[in-house]
Amino acid sequence: LTCLGGFASPGPVPPSTALRELIEELVNITQNQKAPLCNGSMVWSINLTAGMYCAALESLINVSGCSAIEKTQRMLSGFCPHKVSAGQFSSLHVRDTKIEVAQFVKDLLLHLKKLFREGQFN
């Protein structure tokens, strides 16, 4: 899980420190998880497609009083510092399924690792 150095970056694209750091933070969260993450709080699942960073931020921001994910919230803000337009928000908020924060983090981590391997840093 922690061996990010093993990810191959295709072509001349330089590795993204921002994506790497986000992955490392999510790895830390999953590995250091003793009690249920954020007391088992539930968040809306998201489509791991275009607009994923903003959607992930919008979902995780609704978990209050959980210091374990505040750094993740702030790191996601780096990818999505300004609100997307009102029209784009409808696609971000497909609010039909709730999952535990721990599962959300694991799903996000797996997807980000895939993006990193493929060199999709933005």
Epitope: E21, I61, S77, G78, P81
Partner: antibody
Framework: EVQLVESGGGLVQPGGSLRLSCAAS????????MSWVRQAPGKGLEWVAS???????YYPDSVKGRFTISRDNAKNSLYLQMNSLRAEDTAVYYC????????????WGRGTLVTVSS | DIQMTQSPSSLSASVGDRVTITCRAS??????????VHWYQQKPGKAPKLLIY???SLETGVPSRFSGSGSGTDFTLTISSLQPEDFATYYC?????????FGGGTKVEIK
Amino acid sequence: EVQLVESGGGLVQPGGSLRLSCAASGFTFSSYAMSWVRQAPGKGLEWVASISTGDTTYYPDSVKGRFTISRDNAKNSLYLQMNSLRAEDTAVYYCARNEGYYFGLTQWGRGTLVTVSS
Amino acid sequence: DIQMTQSPSSLSASVGDRVTITCRASESVDHFGWSLVHWYQQKPGKAPKLLIYRADSLETGVPSRFSGSGSGTDFTLTISSLQPEDFATYYCQQSNEDPWTFGGGTKVEIK
């Protein structure tokens, strides 16, 4: 300790160009969005530009097409290229770490003064 | 653009006083239950400093005498007991809509 140090300000004639720089230290620069905010003499604050970690840029209409924000993560530096400068662009320009619409502008530099005058 | 109107524009107060500054947005700056308003302090010749984010969350390292409240269009920054180092200008800012906009500022002076 987080530090943001702006440079490149000075006197420029209307219609001229200037490039501001911001040197960042004390944090992982490439992992944060960044912004420029300006303050005309004796006036309030005005947001000028932002850039995400993925290099998406954002501008208000007042500078769109004239100003360009960019970053060089290898040099831990943020830039603002200002073209077609007007008298109303005269201000202290601050570089700020932008932690997004939920968290605000969390760290600021001391600013650099840009004066547009003939 | 969303206009942020602060009042008063200036006030005089003494050390130990309770100080309240208000900020009114021209339209709601609430977003899915969060109020996207932030408060900054600026001393003469210095850079602004973030005090409060998301209307009522205290930024790390900021003294607890500062607090924020409000939702929708009306927001308040309160200093429970004014200290000598609190004499400065305070700005509100909204991030609910581009362009991000600031209030005109409230200068807190020594009485």
